[in-house]
Interface confidence: medium
């Protein structure tokens, strides 16, 4: 159910492209293709190519993305395209001008003087943005989300986008300055990962990040469990970045116990993040118990 055919508008296409990209990434990183049949990988890559080609139809002259060409471009959607395409660069041929043009647009058009990224045209499919939905800490959450995307595109785009390092620094400054005031576990987790990527999650900030965990194994807010899976996945990525392997096992165990295999309405972010985090875990912490993730993969009937 994770290998699906992407289709629809610029948002629906990304919803459809997400599980396939992350499934291939996960199975590549964890070397589990034999379990599912190596021949299935090629079919999955074809679907990713299809999703990529379709997404280009929603790229605007400014290099940003929107649900429709005539709709105002979305900061979140453009950052998410950057995030997914940055991961897919190792899977299919992606034009660096497409990817880095989007990065440039985010920095030049949507970053405020204090480093904050602003959204002027929210996505139609609000279910796809995960824990950012109805988040009263929007400046922090969105800035962290965009910053993570920029950092994932850094190696590819640094030469093409001169302002990228400065933009990353500025966004990091904003997150660091406001981190201690955060109330929501979700925002603590996503901003924590963004700061950990920069080597700036330390001292009182690190303490806040760690003590926000419930029972030392999850980053949880009241409400949707999907958001807690997403938040805890960000937190796991932060812990792996910090090389805090004492804290890692209970978090991985909790994520595994959720038996969350992705897919379904509103699952875009949780799916992407949980598999990205667990792939990173298996890569970074190979000595820890192997995770028995029964990832079911199905190619659509032709």
């Amino acid at each position: 159910h994770l290998i699906v055919t992407p289709s629809g508008c610029g948002e629906q296409n990304m919803i459809g492209m997400t599980p396939t990209v992350i499934a291939v990434h996960y199975l590549d990183e964890t070397e589990q293709w034999e379990k599912f049949g190596l021949e299935k990988r090629q079919g999955a890559l074809e679907l990713i190519k299809k999703g990529y080609t379709q997404q280009l139809a929603f790229r605007q002259p400014s290099s940003a993305f929107a649900a429709f060409v005539k709709r105002a471009p979305s900061t979140w959607l453009t950052a998410y395209v950057v995030k997914v395409f940055s991961l897919a660069v190792n899977l299919i041929a992606i034009d660096s001008q497409v990817l880095c043009g989007a990065v440039k647009w985010l920095i030049l058009e949507k970053q405020k003087p204090d480093g904050v990224f602003q959204e002027d045209a929210p996505v139609i499919h609000q279910e796809m943005i995960g824990g950012l939905r109805n988040n009263n800490e929007k400046d922090m959450a969105l800035t962290a989300f965009v910053l993570i995307s920029l950092q994932e595109a850094k190696d590819i785009c640094e030469e093409q986008v001169n302002s990228l390092p400065g933009s990353i620094t500025k966004a990091g400054d904003f997150l660091e300055a406001n981190y201690m005031n955060l109330q929501r576990s979700y925002t603590v987790a996503i901003a924590g990962y963004a700061l950990a990527q920069m080597g700036r999650l330390k001292g009182p900030l690190l303490n806040k990040f760690l003590t926000t965990a419930k029972d030392k194994n999850r980053w949880e807010d009241p409400g949707k469990q999907l958001y807690n899976v997403e938040a805890t996945s960000y937190a796991l990525l932060a812990l792996l970045q910090l090389k805090d392997f004492d804290f890692v096992p209970p978090v991985v165990r909790w994520l595994n116990e959720q038996r969350y295999y992705g897919g379904g309405y509103g699952s875009t972010q949780a799916t992407f993040m949980v598999f990205q985090a667990l792939a990173q875990y298996q890569k970074d912490a190979p000595d820890h118990q192997e995770l028995n993730l029964d990832v079911s993969l199905q190619l659509p009937s032709r």
């Epitope: 058009e109 949507k110 970053q111 003087p113 904050v116 620094t169």
Partner: antibody
Framework: EVQLQQSGPVLVKPGASVKMSCKAS????????MNWVRQSHGKSLEWIGV????????SYNQKFKGKATLTVDKSSSTAYMELNSLTSEDSAVYYC????WGQGTSVTVSS | DVVMTQTPLTLSVTIGQPASISCKSS???????????LNWLLQRPGQSPKRLIY???KVDSGVPDRFTGSGSGTDFTLKINRVEAEDLGVYYC?????????FGGGTKLEIK
Amino acid sequence: EVQLQQSGPVLVKPGASVKMSCKASGYTFTAYYMNWVRQSHGKSLEWIGVINPYNGGTSYNQKFKGKATLTVDKSSSTAYMELNSLTSEDSAVYYCSSPYWGQGTSVTVSS
Amino acid sequence: DVVMTQTPLTLSVTIGQPASISCKSSQSLLDSDGKTYLNWLLQRPGQSPKRLIYLVSKVDSGVPDRFTGSGSGTDFTLKINRVEAEDLGVYYCWQGTHFPRTFGGGTKLEIK
């Protein structure tokens, strides 16, 4: 020659709003952030906020959030600041700075 | 918010003599990009402020070389090596590292 030309002095009643302008010339308007600063009579300077003329992104001093609104018109190289719900406390000279400084706009709030 | 403390409040100097103004910040002004955003302004009587120095020690074009800025972290100094009549006015330091930007209270330079 670099110039920031600010609009003239205003006298307004309490509760009213005022919108002042700052027209830039002699340099590339979008190349520098535009700061707005307040100076109450005989006092020091107080930072209100900043706008990026390239994309209109704004950042405010918490104290002035809801009081000041910063905008720009790239086509005329002009920055604007609107102040609302004015009280006598808002009587001051308001400067734009980019890092050049305008001559200031004097705002007097009086009934 | 970062507090900027300037001393002295008033400085009376004879023309041709040196003058020195101190500015201390409550937090380090070294930004994560490695730069220190500390500026000095001069506001002459009845005029708007004018920037003299930025990034601690870089002198703006058109500013006489008798003005020098120095310092790092939290301690900064503006020096005028030979005061001239046109230097009278109020000097302000302000920081551009942290949000919100903050100014010192000002130092009034008087000619003896």
